[in-house]
């Protein structure tokens, strides 16, 4: 997180840490973690942790490890022979089904999914919270959780920023309605290592709750604007995937 500040896991109890690759995710119920497809495409058996503000190796040993049962990548995510050259991050969303249910508590609890009503349509200027252990101004990886509050911005703002190290022609980068552009204020942004974490917005119908409006996906340059998977467009797929892959006692 660039331009963010120290955060306590108690304020982001849905935050999941993936250690390989170094990334994030969001707990959405006791059996399921939501993340970005690009986080899990190269590792279908990710090790995840919840409930810890610090991901220092010695501290992780004492925190709650989650074991995956299966990874479900959105069928619209294009799997590439050489993922390094990716310019299309459309449908950057995945679900991880856990082997065992997560025990909830003050440092571990799920984030809501967006509702289907127009109340959950984001407007430019709407604020969302991002959190993670990715690159900061000072460190290549944060050991302690960082967070920032960012406004939603028009997609064109993201398009206008020059990609820092283009793996292809600038025109090749794909922008779709499945993406939210956010940031641009005071240099606050997500960055490498924050991928898959939630862009959390206050629930319009219950101010005590947050919902995952977006997932950290990609960006042209850290510290400018970032692109987030628009979770609202995938709620049907999420619900269907969870229903089709739940055990009878969960139903």
């Amino acid at each position: 997180i660039i331009g963010g500040s120290d955060a306590d896991i108690k304020n982001f109890p849905w935050q999941v840490f993936f250690d390989n690759p170094w990334a994030g995710g969001a707990l959405i119920n006791e059996y399921w973690v939501l993340t970005a497809a690009h986080v899990v495409e190269g590792n279908r058996e990710p090790t995840m942790y919840v409930g810890s503000t610090s991901v220092q190796t010695s501290r992780l040993a004492k925190s709650k490890m989650l074991t995956p049962e299966h990874v479900f990548i959105h069928p619209g995510w294009k799997l590439l022979e050489v993922p390094e050259g990716r310019t299309n991050f459309d449908n950057d969303i995945a679900l991880v089904r856990l082997k065992d249910p997560v025990k909830m508590g003050p440092t571990v609890s799920p984030i809501c999914l967006p509702g289907t009503s127009s109340d959950y349509n984001l407007m430019d200027g709407d604020l969302g919270l991002i959190s993670g252990w990715g690159r900061t101004e000072k460190r290549d990886r944060a050991v302690r959780l960082k967070a920032a509050r960012l406004p939603v911005a028009p997609l064109r703002k993201c398009k206008e920023v020059k990609v820092e190290k283009p793996t292809a022609d600038a025109e090749a980068y794909v922008f779709t309605p499945n993406m939210i552009c956010a940031g641009g204020e005071k240099g606050m942004d997500s960055c490498k290592g924050d991928s898959g974490g939630a862009f959390a917005v206050q629930d319009p119908n219950d101010k005590t709750k947050f919902y995952a409006a977006g997932l950290v996906s990609w960006g042209p340059q850290c510290g400018t604007y970032g692109l987030y998977t628009r979770v609202k467009n995938y709620v049907d797929w999420i619900m269907k995937t969870m229903q089709e892959n739940s055990t009878p006692r969960e139903d």
Partner: antibody
Framework: EVKLQQSGAELVRPGASVKLSCTAS????????IHWVKQRPEQGLEWIGR????????KYAPKFQVKATITADTSSNTAYLQLSSLTSEDTAVYYC????????????WGQGTTLTVSS | DIVLTQSPASLAVSLGQRATISCKAS??????????MNWYQQKTGQPPKILIY???NLESGIPARFSGSGSGTDFTLNIHPVEEEDAAIYYC?????????FGGGTKLEIK
Amino acid sequence: EVKLQQSGAELVRPGASVKLSCTASGFNIKDDYIHWVKQRPEQGLEWIGRIDPADGHTKYAPKFQVKATITADTSSNTAYLQLSSLTSEDTAVYYCARYGYGREVFDYWGQGTTLTVSS
Amino acid sequence: DIVLTQSPASLAVSLGQRATISCKASQSVDYDGDSYMNWYQQKTGQPPKILIYDASNLESGIPARFSGSGSGTDFTLNIHPVEEEDAAIYYCQQSNEDPWTFGGGTKLEIK
């Protein structure tokens, strides 16, 4: 298994340039950070700089800012260190190393490349 | 740059005894409640190997006879009981501030 394989020893003339390579296996360099460290004969270790291969973002120690250029090719999972305007002071073993997970250390190292600058 | 001064430059310790190596930083290497001081071991012809990270945490697979302590500017590496295979050069390294810097090294000989 994580491994960093460095290119072979080099003997070069003063004033020339050289490009050393470090090929990773067991992990994708785009998910990581690769550092380079210099060790002169019978001397200590000096940090040269590092690269984020995902976006080419580099940082250098001030004394190596002009001397060294670090690059990476994610398609071949390889990082490079180019050294220019070589002098006898550049005679050393050069190591590439991976930045650790959950601790700010070098957790895996290449075997080192010996560079000898001599006429 | 943060300068790290190691002492002694070399020491000889009898098998089974304690080896103590000191590392002093020219300014604090503490940040966010952690001390960003690490210790490496380097044997002849090999790259360095991480032993201790964040001043006192033992790297996985490293024997418990190695321990680290300290905070701020003063740090110590202890090896007890010393074994034959511990003959090497030991370096402290700070990762709190760019550029990352190393101490000058301490050569440990086993008597």
